[in-house]
Amino acid sequence: WELTILHTNDVHSRLEQTSEDSSKCVNASRCMGGVARLFTKVQQIRRAEPNVLLLDAGDQYQGTIWFTVYKGAEVAHFMNALRYDAMALGNHEFDNGVEGLIEPLLKEAKFPILSANIKAKGPLASQISGLYLPYKVLPVGDEVVGIVGYTSKETPFLSNPGTNLVFEDEITALQPEVDKLKTLNVNKIIALGHSGFEMDKLIAQKVRGVDVVVGGHSNTFLYTGNPPSKEVPAGKYPFIVTSDDGRKVPVVQAYAFGKYLGYLKIEFDERGNVISSHGNPILLNSSIPEDPSIKADINKWRIKLDNYSTQELGKTIVYLDGSSQSCRFRECNMGNLICDAMINNNLRHTDEMFWNHVSMCILNGGGIRSPIDERNNGTITWENLAAVLPFGGTFDLVQLKGSTLKKAFEHSVHRYGQSTGEFLQVGGIHVVYDLSRKPGDRVVKLDVLCTKCRVPSYDPLKMDEVYKVILPNFLANGGDGFQMIKDELLRHDSGDQDINVVSTYISKMKVIYPAVEGRIKFS
């Protein structure tokens, strides 16, 4: 019996087609992805093949103005239109709290939404009961397939699930659910989830009875043969893991942002054992036409977005200096504003010993593309912020050793004075440079804000200590020459859309007046 698994993950509100780098589509003839194009391909495969499942491994939420405005209603609407068969909860599905998941998505989805390792307690338990499931048995042709879900247990540090959801260890939670399915004579089981490629592989290895793992969170690109675009494969598709009980378990993921549609064909024997598996992600490029009816629906929904981008978010009573002349040479108040917003967006009081789990932010000055003048009645709009942060990036959470941070700050000024983008703006950090010293030895003082303290204060950076830092995904990926961050980071979790972070902060503060306050000094 043959099953075709079509899968997406980490779509991050890319409902419209995008450029090759998943930013805003500029030249339509070269654009990719989007739900209208995805629907064309899915329908083509459904017509050609008998047993097809369309699955999503989480993080539909967060990433463009679509999510900012529609808050998840767009996800439910278009996933329903594409007739997804199941979805796993990702960490970003909790970005607007549990209510922001229940109302727009859980109550509206016409497909099961899954996670076996999230347990509700207290008053939430009855409110959310049955709205998401640990597993769902689906009819596929004349057979049945069990889909069991899982979600990153780091979600409380990455999003806003509140205090009434407990995120258990994935493997511990999955095994009894898979055992239950086996007891119920369901012999073809897919683990669908959002914990990253390393955990996907562990699940394939450790959870007895799982036949296939469809993952997300780490934006992993797998491919067999010559890759069709810029993404470099982390391994073959499918990636085969030998389980502890000796089975060959295919593990797949389909990069991110709806650029590819994962396509995996599995052959099962009559006892539900995987005989063979093969496939590849399908690049959703312009050779695949956008479905006209879905496209028309997108255009209808788009109207509200255009109206939103010119509405006032808040006011500034000071000039927001985002000029290259400032932000690439010294502390600039636009950099301070953005870093303060980044920290504020990551406030998670999950431990009595810590006032917060993260206190530091770094931001490449070259990523700040425009100032905002306060003399326009102080008004700040989404449109203004899109000029400051035009690249559609995310502000991510990483863990780095102090020694890596020190290298990053040396890199920040290694060729100071040439208006280059690597000059770092900061939050929760006090740095002093001596430019008379040779490159690589110019950081004379580097103090960081404590987290394990009741009264936050600045202490010298310790080289061997591990620190959490919020930074743009551009830097986490080694951009602007920050190769040491990419090479030495100990953990990397994708965060929220950059403009969304700053806009939310401005809306919350209502009136802002960021200052230049001595975060960066020269001796």
Partner: nanobody
């Protein structure tokens, strides 16, 4: 081989009663949410009543509330639908369906999600 077999259908006069049975072979109904659905000629299939395996919670469509009763006998691996005060508009093919997923009885009956196991159906005709 897993099977759901419905029985008890037939011709009945308006105001009369029938009891439908759904017998399962190949799986234990204790662990399943069970539903009765019906499809009248030219109409969509609709959920009539559902019952859970765990806490025996039930759900009824508004159109049958107070007239129909769902019950289960786990020792016989059978679910019943007692139908009373039957009307002409109750005429339909009645199907039994089962889902081992932990869905609510309401989600099962709507049905919110695809249901994996179905019987072949039994015809109920209400006519004088």
């Amino acid at each position: 081989q897993r099977q759901l077999v419905e029985s008890g259908g037939g011709l009945v006069q308006p105001g009369g009663s029938l009891r439908l049975s759904c017998a399962a072979s190949g799986f234990l109904l204790d662990y399943y949410v069970i539903g009765w659905f019906r499809q009248a000629p030219g109409k969509e299939r609709e959920g009539v009543s559902c019952i859970s395996g765990s806490d025996r919670s039930t759900y009824y469509a508004d159109s049958v509330k107070g007239r129909f009763t769902i019950s289960r006998d786990n020792s016989k691996n059978t679910v019943y639908l007692q139908m009373g005060s039957l009307r002409a508009e109750d005429t339909a093919v009645y199907y039994c369906a089962a889902d081992p997923s932990p869905v609510t009885v309401q989600a099962m009956c709507l049905p919110r999600f695809p249901v994996p196991y179905w019987g072949q159906g039994t015809l109920v005709t209400v006519s004088s």
